[in-house]
């Protein structure tokens, strides 16, 4: 339904607190360099304006679109060109082009320092003094570093953050209480960020149809007792919601997400038997709970997939009558039977099925032609299963850090032109798949591994797109989203690469490494490892092990030395010489 004032409508639906949070996220995602104080001032102005529109929808400017109102606010910022360069050119455009222009200038890798968590006492003090400002800073810092973060979900994480601080700041050992809990929230939020970026990439590159197919597969796995029409309705709504958030329509996105949660809770009988616990929660928690819901039990009496999609003599007629519906029902029927498959795999199977029908329905004897299609799925299913098996075995043998290093060597060999920080980040994230997925029951491993890897590789693609340096990476990234992971897995050592010359300064370390937290120490070592591989792409596993072991011993020895600086200065050149020799 149309509303006289869009902004008044959203303010009333969302309530002041969520409204303000979403406006702050929107501004932080568009103008990623602005300080919190500047954004919060704009948020207050927008909120005050929304309140005047709630009081009188006919008041001046209340009929303007939210994009127009937000864009006008952003374009009124003084020194916009000084701080943002060509993003200021967007302001010369009219809506909707202006918003499109803002979206194109979102930076996936902004030049911002890593978000440093203050120490526990200081954190609790500032939280207790002004919880609203403290959580506002959290929204701002996360949103500007992750300009595609799913806004309603970020509000949920802020709520979690609030809960943790409320609970832990009354404890005597605040740090012991805060650290593990905040680490858990951070880990979940970082995974959410890469997953959402993948959804926005899918929407931007391949359109709504591709995203909707993803949603149909996912919903069918979760709700195998729901009818096809019900699944398609949910997928249509989820597609709309994600399109809005990816497009910067955060108020509409959050409002529609709450509406969908309400609909699902009112229609549990036709969706899933597992929803009740979620439906008793308040709105943010309810939506999040529904998004993470466990799979419903598969109906016991499901007939073989072959009956309707291979053996039925009407297959080509049904396909011709309504291709989208027929392929949709195939994806639905296959997915609801296979919660143990990744969505990427299910979409590859649906694509294979579609290609088979396209070919066979044009031939003389279609049933004979498409009769073997299910058997032809076998190699497509085996490939990711083997990937999971070999990688989980390697993870179990090496542990997370060792597994990350193995992945780093592998990916540096595949794409040595990619910058070392990007390779290290990708390998560390890819390596976490072991901890995240390999400990799960067998039936949950494949979907966990492959869909997580796909999201991490999408991040690699997004960063590489900004400064393309590897033809192989470009090739894998420009293909279909569901083929990306197999494409990267199939890459081998890049034979065209001219090895980097050995630079002693790359492998020169100082005593400051001793005081770094473990994570930073690991990153330093992994940076050195990637540089070694770039110097010697065909180095054997044993050679790399020797050099890295030598390096670890050197750091350990010098960090224990009485005169650390002297140790690094004298032992460092010896290490460099031994490393060169070992790799010769």
């Amino acid at each position: 339904e149309a509303h006289k004032s869009e902004i008044a409508h959203r303010f009333k639906d969302l309530g002041e607190q969520h409204f303000k949070g979403l406006v702050l996220i929107a501004f932080s995602q568009y103008l990623q360099k602005c300080p919190y104080e500047e954004h919060i001032k704009l948020v207050q102005e927008v909120t005050d304006f929304a309140k005047t529109c709630v009081a009188d929808e006919n008041a001046e400017n209340c009929d303007k679109s939210i994009h127009t109102l937000f864009g006008d606010k952003l374009c009124a910022i003084p020194k916009l060109r000084d701080n943002y360069g060509e993003l200021a050119d967007c302001c010369a455009k009219q809506e909707p082009e202006r918003n499109e222009c803002f979206l194109q200038h979102k930076d996936d890798n902004p030049n911002l320092p890593p978000f440093q968590r203050p120490e526990a006492e200081a954190m609790c003090t500032s939280f207790q003094e002004n919880p609203t400002s403290f959580l506002g800073h959290y929204l701002h810092e996360v949103a500007r570093r992750h300009p595609y973060f799913y806004a309603p979900e970020l509000l949920y994480y802020a709520e979690k953050y609030n809960e943790v601080l409320t609970q832990c700041c009354t404890e005597s050992d605040k740090a012991a209480c805060l650290t593990p809990k905040l680490d858990a929230v951070k880990e979940k939020a970082l995974v959410a960020a890469v997953r959402q970026r993948m959804k926005c990439s899918s929407m931007q590159r391949f359109g709504e149809r591709a995203f909707k197919a993803w949603a149909v597969a996912r919903m069918s796995q979760r709700f195998p007792n729901a009818e096809f029409a019900e699944i398609t309705k949910l997928a249509t709504d989820v597609t709309k919601i994600n399109k809005e958030c990816c497009h910067g329509d955060l108020l509409e996105c959050a409002d529609d997400r709450a509406e969908l949660a309400k609909y699902m809770c009112e229609n549990q009988a036709t969706i899933s038997s597992k929803l009740q616990a979620c439906c008793d929660k308040p709105v943010l928690q309810k939506s999040q709970c529904l998004a993470e819901i466990e799979h419903d039990n598969i109906p016991a009496d499901l007939p073989s997939i072959a009956a309707d999609f291979v053996e039925d003599k009407e297959v080509c007629k049904n396909y011709a009558e309504a291709k989208d519906v027929f392929l949709g029902t195939f994806l639905y029927e296959y997915s609801r039977r296979h919660p143990d498959y990744s969505v990427s795999l299910l979409l590859r199977l649906a694509k294979k099925y579609e290609a088979t029908l396209e070919k066979c329905c044009a031939e003389g004897d279609p049933p004979a032609c498409y009769g073997t299609v299910l058997a032809e799925f076998q190699p497509l299913v085996e490939e990711p299963k083997n990937l999971v098996k070999t990688n989980c075995e390697l993870y179990e043998k090496l542990g997370e850090y060792g597994f990350q290093n193995a992945v780093l060597v592998r990916y540096t060999q595949k794409a040595p032109q990619v910058s070392t920080p990007t390779l290290v980040e990708a390998a560390r994230n890819l390596g976490r798949v072991g901890t995240k997925c390999c400990t799960l029951p067998e039936a949950q491993r494949l979907p966990c591994v492959e869909d997580y890897l796909s999201a991490i590789l999408n991040r690699l693609c997004v960063l590489h797109e900004k400064t393309p340096v590897s033809e192989k990476v470009t090739k894998c990234c420009s293909g279909s989203l569901v083929e990306r992971r197999p494409c990267f897995s199939a890459l081998t050592v890049d034979e065209t690469y001219v090895p980097k010359e050995f630079k002693a300064e790359t492998f020169t370390f100082h005593s400051d490494i001793c005081t770094l937290p473990d994570k930073e120490k690991q990153i330093k070592k992994q940076t050195a490892l990637a540089e070694l591989v770039k110097h010697k792409p065909k180095a054997t596993e044993d050679q790399l092990k020797t050099v890295m072991g030598d390096f670890a011993q050197f750091v350990d020895k010098c960090c224990k030395a009485a005169d650390k600086d002297n140790c690094f200065a004298t032992e460092g050149p010896n290490l460099v010489a031994r490393s060169k020799e070992a790799l010769a």
């Epitope: 029409a229 019900e230 309705k233 709504d237």
Partner: nanobody, 117 residues
Framework: EVQLLESGGGLVQPGGSLRLSCAAS????????MGWVRQAPGKGLEWVSL????????YYADSVKGRFTISRDNSKNTLYLQMNSLRAEDTAVYYC??????????WGQGTLVTVSS
């Protein structure tokens, strides 16, 4: 017993508009997905559109996207198809149909739409 009664068909010039209606009875209308299917003279059936009980559109044929709009009024047990920018190739008998689980299980008698100058 399930009954579906279409109305609103007729002769219209290319570029013109028509609104088809379908009055449903004999079942709980607001529990079912409904749709429109058409059959052009001498041709097979073509699905036009499907709408979920909640009013969310879940399918349009590529040939009608952007021109046709399906809607429903659950309080009146009625399904609609607003057809704009009609073309000669839209000439067909239009059937209202009830969807059950994986296919249409009941159809109306159909209403003829002729697009001609």
């Amino acid at each position: 017993e399930v009954q579906l009664l279409e109305s609103g068909g007729g002769l219209v010039q290319p570029g013109g508009s028509l609104r088809l209606s379908c009055a449903a009875s004999g079942f709980t209308f607001n529990h079912y997905t409904m749709g429109w299917v058409r059959q052009a003279p001498g041709k097979g059936l073509e699905w036009v559109s499907l709408i979920h009980p909640s009013g969310t559109v879940i399918y349009y044929a590529d040939s009608v996207k952007g021109r046709f709009t399906i809607s429903r009024d659950n309080s009146k047990n009625t399904l609609y198809l607003q057809m704009n920018s009609l073309r000669a190739e839209d000439t067909a008998v239009y059937y209202c149909a009830k969807w059950s689980s994986r296919a249409f299980d009941y159809w109306g008698q159909g209403t003829l739409v002729t697009v001609s100058s």
